[in-house]
Interface confidence: low
């Protein structure tokens, strides 16, 4: 097996071509590093799978907004 990769940067090489139900999403992070081929959003699902998505797509923007609001609203 080849040597472990040392680069700390995570990149997306392709985007999901399906809309993911917001109920399946737990969190997200933006990928903007110039070391990566594409700007991207990485969603983490409720089963901890990381999914690359296109930040230009409306459903991705809506999902990020939804997750932002969830984070801001304290759970009672």
């Amino acid at each position: 097996q080849p040597d472990a990769i040392n680069a700390p940067v995570t990149c997306c090489y392709n985007f999901t071509n399906r809309k993911i139900s917001v109920q399946r999403l737990a969190s997200y992070r933006r990928i903007t590093s110039s070391k990566c081929p594409k700007e991207a959003v990485i969603f983490k699902t409720i089963v901890a799978k990381e999914i690359c998505a296109d930040p230009k797509q409306k459903w991705v923007q809506d999902s990020m907004d939804h997750l932002d609001k969830q984070t801001q609203t304290p759970k009672t």
Epitope: I5, T10, N17, A53
Partner: nanobody
Framework: EVQLVESGGGLVQAGGSLRLSCAAS????????IGWFRQAPGKEREGPLC????????YYADSVKGRFTISSDNAKNTVYLQMNSLKPEDTAVYYC????????????????????WGQGTQVTVSS
């Protein structure tokens, strides 16, 4: 158990071509991505050079775009890497790697996600 076996490496002159094969067993390609990586002597692993995903999408790194082509034969559970216009700097051990796309099969994996690796095949390009 997932197993990957690469073949097709060898010695070729600059400007020549090679076709590498990655034969998979223990899984089907329906919910997997296969990537090709390489490691030159004394250097870090480079890649993914290219990725073929079960949704039909492909990715190519700039260093191989226009020279390398990834394709798959699902019936044979084999992925091919056609390498044209080879350069001495392409000399390396070439590895294929596989990773499940997960329960949803939604996206190609992130570069560090590849969990199953072949043993590698040596490609030497002489000038």
């Amino acid at each position: 158990e997932v197993q990957l076996v690469e073949s097709g490496g060898g010695l070729v002159q600059a400007g020549g071509s090679l076709r590498l094969s990655c034969a998979a067993s223990g899984f089907t390609f329906d919910d997997y991505a296969i990537g090709w990586f390489r490691q030159a002597p004394g250097k870090e692993r480079e890649g993914p050079l290219c990725i073929s995903s079960s949704d039909g999408s492909t990715y190519y790194a700039d260093s191989v775009k226009g020279r390398f082509t990834i394709s798959s034969d699902n019936a044979k559970n084999t992925v091919y890497l056609q390498m044209n216009s080879l350069k001495p700097e392409d000399t390396a051990v070439y590895y294929c790697a596989a990773e499940s796309l997960g329960d949803y099969g939604l996206a190609s994996p992130l570069p560090a996600d590849f969990g199953s690796w072949g043993q590698g095949t040596q490609v030497t390009v002489s000038s």
